[in-house]
Amino acid sequence: QGWQAFKNDATEIIPELGEYPEPPPELENNKTMNRAENGGRPPHHPFETKDVSEYSCRELHFTRYVTDGPCRSAKPVTELVCSGQCGPARLLPNAIGRGKWWRPSGPDFRCIPDRYRAQRVQLLCPGGEAPRARKVRLVASCKCKRLTRFHNQSELKDFGTEAARPQKGRKPRPRARSAKANQAELENAY
């Protein structure tokens, strides 16, 4: 279960970390020059697909600089933001036009990070200070998960066959920094 192949010439690829998914940082604005891709999954065709395994959410590539105190990565790193619609194959006619909409009463499906990868990033520091390094965790792929009415709203259920499989030996990531003083402060590069 290695991470997806992912090349960034500013950094070194580190293998899978094996942890629970968690949401990516919020984007401060949407003025991106990023492309939406499906990360090797079948494309999302909500009007034709019958097999739930074919539903996937969009993986938006975006870049950000990694900063640590006064130091900043020489080049931005690229990661994914999970976006788009996930849902079951229950489609209802739309009164306006010929399109179809998800049934609003159905389960709440979410597009969230599935896998992470870690990179060792070189940081340049001002004033002649020696370069530093920092390990950062980046979203590597996304998946559809759902909230059911029988569970707490914060509990995410896997979409499709993986729901029955226990996640072995996976742990939540530590929050070593507050949002205000983040260990690796995030700067989006647009």
Partner: antibody
Amino acid sequence: EVQLQQSGAELVRPGALVKLSCKASGFNIKDYYMHWVKQRPEQGLEWIGRIDPENGDIIYDPKFQGKASITTDTSSNTAYLQLSSLTSEDTAVYYCAYDAGDPAWFTYWGQGTLVTVSS
Amino acid sequence: DIVMTQSHKFMSTSVGDRVTITCKASQDVFTAVAWYQQKPGQSPKLLIYWASTRHTGVPDRFTGSGSGTDFTLTISNVQSEDLADYFCQQYSSYPLTFGAGTKLELK
């Protein structure tokens, strides 16, 4: 919950060796750099060295080179410190700690392991 | 190696006072300095990093400042729970080094 659970106190003979463990839970050690720090009774803190568990890269303080050996087992999410040719000078509390920076400060620390070298 | 010097081994204070603990580096460490608090029988706890950034959950009565070679940790409105040892550490370069510590005690 993030935790670094260190092994229990050790009473060892001069000249012997001891291996201390530091088991991480709540995070994956490959995400971070694992460090070991020594504190002698009523004294300050001395950095021993650090390991990058992802690739085994190690940096020691030169004064601990030959005395300390740092290893990790990523399958058990555990870091180890082995101390050899023990003398009374090695009597101390040994802490493991970690952070994502290199070099860095230490965000989290283990509870410490007391090693007593005595005949 | 970079030597971190904490000139006061002990500092006396009273509850409600303001106290400043100093740390001097033997060479320029920019702002790559952290401060830790350690109480008897406990492991050190991170207070400040990058000379002035407060770690999560640290009360705002703890303030770090300085750059280059001179650094201070100021505790305003000292509380009884602040009585402890305080260590500075540089992480500008390897080997990482600590100050010898300053014990904050009641007058």
